[in-house]
């Protein structure tokens, strides 16, 4: 069994190295920014929505294109839940320093957890998306 796990880990590692997760990162960042543009963000100052909607985000076409490419990449991990989790963790690691607020970080994690389901894939049951060094608010 140990031997099988070792081979599984190696296979996952090479899958992760081959995968291009950028479209997933681009899709998620566009999605959480689009949501903020729509609903405003800071509950303490509703009259001062910090970001105004931009035509770039309104189009949505770019994001759906990213989502399609993202799903194609995630599809490679469909039969290995642990490896799917590692892919999600890698996405979180790659974007954590872009998220300078608790709300943005939580929303990104929410969307990230939903990503496999959005792609019609099984989501890993237990997948810790906390970033490693420095805890939740590393950047």
């Amino acid at each position: 069994r140990q031997q099988w796990e070792l081979q599984g880990d190696r296979r996952c590692q090479s899958q992760l190295e081959r995968a291009n997760l950028r479209p997933c990162e681009q899709h998620l960042m566009q999605k959480i920014q689009r949501d903020e543009d729509s609903y405003g963000r800071d509950p303490y100052s509703p009259s001062q929505d910090p970001y105004s909607p931009s035509p770039y985000d309104r189009r949505g076409a770019g994001s759906s294109q990213h989502q399609e490419r993202c799903c194609n990449e995630l599809n490679e991990f469909e039969n290995n839940q642990r490896c799917m989790c590692e892919a999600l963790q890698q996405i979180m690691e790659n974007q954590s320093d872009r998220l300078q607020g608790r709300q943005q970080e939580q929303q990104f994690k929410r969307e990230l957890r939903n990503l496999p389901q959005q792609c019609g894939l099984r989501a890993p049951q237990r997948c810790d998306l906390e970033v490693e060094s420095g805890g939740r608010d590393r950047y």
């Epitope: 950028r22 990162e25 681009q26 998620l28 960042m29 566009q30 920014q33 963000r41 800071d42 509950p43 303490y44 100052s45 910090p50 970001y51 931009s54 770039y56 990213h66 790659n94 974007q95 872009r98 998220l99 300078q100 607020g101 608790r102 709300q103 943005q104 420095g134 805890g135 939740r136 608010d137 590393r138 950047y139």
Partner: antibody, heavy 118, light 111 residues
Framework: QVQLVESGGGVVQPGRSLRLSCAAS????????MHWVRQAPGKGLEWVAA????????YYADSVKGRFTISRDNSKNTLYLQMNSLRAEDTAVYYC???????????WGQGTLVTVSS | EIVLTQSPLSLPVTPGEPASISCRSS???????????LDWYLQKPGQSPQLLIY???KRASGVPDRFSGSGSGTDFTLKISRVEAEDVGVYYC????????FGQGTKVEIK
């Protein structure tokens, strides 16, 4: 209404220390990264330091590394900048600013003047 | 360290006329997520700076639509379609890809 109010500035001799404070109100202070930015008289803006929302991560400009320490007390909605071994070139108006959540400086205080002179 | 170079450093403008400011970075400001981490700020005389444009082209809330940002990679531009008297001040670009650094500023004044 968002308010960031800096205090603690003044005249200090080279080599001495000073602590700046920034009191925040009207914002979710403990949800966002906070920054210090300074502006020497008649000069441009210089980013000084930043601290993540939980206080775990701190970043500094090379010009202040090892001399300045940024910290925050989320229970008091206050940001601090401890400035040690001050030099004449640290003379500036110091602004605190709140991050937008995406690395932009969204809200700014009015600034406090620090003068380092013998 | 990423260095930002603005030009011109001084820009005399005529109200009603367009104006543009350039900001060049010593390295690309595109993150792997596709966004350019370049902001524009305006500091009006005697005031604190204010955010105008973030992520190269997104206008911050309350900023008039005569302001627009464009560019990608290392070359960025802030355009004012029709300058108004209240637009005078110093404009700064700022990169937020690696920590944060400002350009040296462009002073915009009425001719």
């Amino acid at each position: 209404q968002v308010q960031l109010v800096e205090s603690g500035g003044g005249v200090v001799q080279p080599g001495r220390s000073l602590r700046l404070s920034c009191a925040a109100s009207g914002i979710a202070f403990n949800d966002y990264t906070m920054h210090w930015v300074r502006q020497a008289p008649g000069k441009g803006l210089e980013w000084v330091a930043a601290i993540s929302y939980g206080g775990t991560n701190k970043y500094y400009a090379d010009s202040v590394k090892g001399r300045f320490t940024i910290s925050r007390d989320n229970s008091k909605n206050t940001l601090y900048l401890q400035m040690n071994s001050l030099r004449a070139e640290d003379t500036a108006v110091y602004y605190c600013a709140r991050d937008s959540g995406y690395r932009s400086l969204l809200h700014w205080g009015q600034g406090t003047l620090v003068t380092v002179s013998s | 360290e990423i260095v930002l170079t603005q030009s011109p450093l001084s820009l005399p403008v005529t109200p009603g006329e367009p104006a543009s400011i350039s900001c060049r970075s010593s390295q690309s400001l595109v993150h792997r997520n596709g966004y350019n981490y370049l902001d524009w700020y305006l500091q009006k005389p005697g005031q604190s700076p204010q955010l105008l444009i973030y992520m190269a082209s997104k206008r911050a809330s309350g900023v008039p639509d005569r302001f627009s940002g464009s560019g990608s990679g290392t070359d960025f531009t802030l355009k004012i379609s029709r300058v108004e008297a209240e637009d005078v001040g110093v404009y700064y670009c700022m990169q937020a890809l690696q920590t944060w650094t400002f350009g040296q500023g462009t002073k915009v004044e009425i001719k």
